[in-house]
């Protein structure tokens, strides 16, 4: 089977979404979890994980093959305490599969905005934290 | 067994906005996607959306997007729809039904005792 | 969107007797097609699943078949019990939907 681990961000106001994202066919989600980390570059695990979430088993239609299963970890306001290095990671339990997601960072700036680099879909988003645009 | 527990009929003025509620019990909640149902008397049924309660994923017919909300608290195993600027055709009787796993069962296994909502002045 | 056309719109029957009901679909579902029994002041229960699979506690009488586009629902020597309204719906592809639903009333 062929499992896809991607990771996105998106801003509602000062809200700051974090995503993850897995496509993946119904007879692999079986014990499988997908989380989000924090500064955790070697022992990334649904434990130190600051949100986890199982995989769908069903993608609530008949006429599909894949199913995505979405964990999104929402940070209200965005401080310097949440600048950091992030990953999305997912793990099987019955096969012992792990999947990394790409690193993407947090950097909260001196002028009270933050960036976030790395993201795969786009390769740079910057926010303004006051004013709550997408620049 | 499985149940689905659906809030008492509602009253409710045009313009107005209500939420009702659908306890689920005797099965994972989170596993299972919840559908959302408007049965207008004497009529058939129409199928609002659904959600499923383990990622928040929430599925809707062109219709009544903008019009219905669907939530789920997973620590209540409660799934609730949101109406909003309510009107005289949003009078119906609402369902809540749970989706069968795919490929096992697939159609809607349980179904709530329905709750009707009446909109008027 | 999939438009599933069900007919007769009623169905008048003696008892005793047996029917078929038919469910179109405005595109192939494969066997993805569901029906529901509703009478009046009741919540609809699940008959058939996936157009021709038995469901546990609904009398061997009733059955269904169909794949693609054109499904029936028939049922062997109706009773009195089984007057009421019944529903297709499909679950092949978003937004899930019903057909508009047979009524089966005593003749």
């Known amino acids: 089977g062929c499992i896809n681990i991607t990771s996105s961000a998106s801003q509602e106001g000062t809200r700051l979404n974090l995503i993850c994202t897995v496509w993946h066919k119904k007879e692999e989600a079986e014990g499988f979890v997908v989380f989000l980390c924090k500064d955790r570059s070697g022992d990334c695990s649904p434990e130190t994980s600051l949100k986890q979430l199982r995989l769908k088993r069903d993608p609530g239609i008949d006429g599909v093959g894949e199913i995505s299963s979405q964990l999104m970890f929402t940070i209200s306001q965005v401080t310097p305490l949440h600048s950091g290095t992030y990953q999305c990671c997912a793990r099987s339990q019955k096969s012992g599969i792990r999947l990394q997601g790409h690193f993407f960072s947090i950097l909260f700036t001196e002028t009270g905005n933050y960036t976030v680099t790395g993201l795969k879909q786009r390769q740079h988003l910057e926010f303004s934290h006051n004013e709550g645009t997408l620049s | 067994q499985v149940h689905l527990q659906q809030s008492g009929a509602e009253l409710a003025r045009p313009g107005a906005s209500v939420k009702l509620s659908c306890k689920a019990s005797?099965?994972?909640?989170?596993?299972?996607?919840m559908q959302w149902i408007k049965q207008r008397p004497g009529q058939g049924l129409e199928w609002i959306g659904s959600i499923y309660p383990g990622d928040d994923d929430a599925r809707y017919t062109q219709k009544f997007r903008g019009k219905a909300t669907l939530t789920a608290d997973k620590s209540s195993s409660t799934a609730y729809m949101q109406l909003s600027s309510l009107a005289s055709e949003d009078s119906a009787v609402y369902y809540c039904?749970?989706?069968?796993?795919?490929?096992?069962?697939?159609?809607?296994?349980?179904w709530g005792q329905g709750t009707t909502l009446t909109v008027s002045s | 969107d999939i438009v599933l056309t069900q007919s007769p719109a009623t169905l008048s029957v003696t008892p005793g007797n047996s029917v078929s009901l038919s469910c179109r679909a405005s595109?192939?579902?494969?066997?993805?097609l569901h029906w529901y029994q509703q009478k009046s002041h009741e919540s609809p229960r699940l008959l058939i699943k996936y157009a021709s699979q038995s469901i546990s506690g609904i009398p061997s009488r009733f059955s269904g078949s169909g794949s693609g586009t054109d499904f029936t629902l028939s049922i062997n020597s109706v009773e009195t019990e089984d007057f009421g309204m019944y529903f297709c719906q499909q679950s092949n592809s978003w937004p899930l939907t019903f057909g508009a639903g047979t009524k089966l009333e005593l003749k």
């Open positions: 005797g099965y994972t909640f989170t596993d299972y996607w």
């Open positions: 595109q192939s579902i494969s066997n993805h």
């Open positions: 039904a749970r989706r069968g796993i795919a490929a096992v069962v697939g159609g809607f296994d349980y």
